[in-house]
């Protein structure tokens, strides 16, 4: 049996016997184009492709449409994997989305969606989510039904304002909505009453800017 040399996601890497968390090279579906991603092989059985991570404010998340499309940052630290890759990947198979959150008081919580995909760029990478469970709120902090993605140079929200400019970062803004994990990073003791912070309303309420966030995906049949 020939050894698999290209992987579409971290679940395939895990199943190939590579079970250490770290940076791996993934290949776009139906393409030879490659992308580097962080694979979490420890959480909940492993095989998770990390699509977003915040931890210290070292990376600027107020980026352009093109940057959010292609990805930015470092997979070893803060980064955004890229909307185009995630859209293509989640359009091929059914994926779950896990969002892990940390506050400044040492608490952790998560939201798990049992079906997640992004529409294509022609639909502004609109997010589709169903089946919420977890400890970070009984109501989805990502507005339902899903919104189009907006950035500072591509305003696709439902607000009379430009949410990405007002709140900072690219996100699936509604008007503007109960979450923004790509907002401005604020350090401890400066993280409350913020209009543009890292927000997950149905866990921490309004104006609370979180310490750390991770968004990761895995095939539903893993």
């Amino acid at each position: 049996k020939e050894e698999q040399t290209t992987f579409r996601d971290c679940a395939e890497i895990f199943k190939s016997g590579l079970t250490t968390s770290g940076i791996y090279t993934l290949t776009f579906p139906n393409s030879t184009e490659e992308i580097k991603a962080y694979c979490d092989m420890d959480v909940g059985g492993g095989g998770w492709t990390v699509i977003q991570h915040r931890e210290d404010g070292s990376v600027d998340f107020q980026r352009t449409w093109k940057e959010y499309k292609e990805g930015f940052g470092s997979p070893l630290g803060e980064y955004w994997l890229g909307n185009e890759f995630v859209s293509q990947l989640t359009g091929q198979h059914r994926y779950v989305l896990k969002i892990q959150l940390k506050d400044w008081e040492g608490n952790e919580a998560h939201s798990l969606y049992d079906h997640f995909y992004l529409a294509g760029e022609e639909s502004n990478y609109r997010i589709h989510l169903t089946g919420l469970t977890g400890t970070a709120g009984k109501i989805s902090s990502i507005s339902q039904p899903g919104s189009d993605f907006s950035t500072k140079d591509s305003d696709n929200d439902k607000c009379i304002c430009k949410c990405s400019q007002m709140l900072s970062g690219g996100w699936w803004f509604d008007a503007c909505g109960p979450s923004n994990l790509n907002g401005q990073y604020y350090p401890q003791k400066q993280n409350t009453n913020k209009f543009n912070g890292i927000k997950w309303y149905y866990w921490k309420g309004s104006g609370y800017s979180l310490k750390a966030t991770t968004m990761m995906i895995r095939p539903a049949d893993f």
Epitope: C159, C161, C163, M166, A175, K194, S206
Partner: nanobody, 129 residues
């Protein structure tokens, strides 16, 4: 740093009146809407009233219409809630909160609670004989 400080709460008899104040610093009222919310023990926080100083428009929950009046003094950067004909069911901790005035959905006039990102610590209003 944005700060909102409520004052004016206390114990009042049914039918009585109170005036709550919300002193705002770190932002100017012209650019923001200020809302009053309340939370009774064991209940969800609910919207009571709100004002957009720039346009002078106001909002009231049905339960307080005709009894409560919201106003603002931009020179003092303060918003007031005049509460008349108070009832025992008005007993709650009252909070003021701020939201950028432009953060409005197309076709809507007011804001969901999750859009208010800056909050005060609250002032207790008790209506009892």
């Amino acid at each position: 740093e944005v700060q909102l400080v409520e004052s004016g709460g206390g114990l009042v008899q049914p039918g009585g009146s109170l005036r709550l104040s919300c002193a705002v610093s770190g932002i100017t009222l012209d650019d923001y809407a200020i809302g009053w919310f309340r939370q009774a023990p064991g209940k969800e926080r609910e919207g009571v009233s709100a004002i957009r100083s720039s346009g002078g428009s106001t909002y009231y929950a049905d339960s307080v219409k005709g009894r409560f009046t919201i106003s603002s003094d931009n020179s003092k950067n303060t918003v007031y809630l005049q509460m008349n004909s108070l009832r025992p069911e008005d007993t709650a901790v009252y909070y003021c909160a701020a939201v950028p005035a432009g953060r409005l959905r197309y076709g809507e006039q007011w804001y969901p609670i999750y859009e208010y990102d800056a909050w005060g610590q609250g002032t207790l209003v008790t209506v009892s004989s």
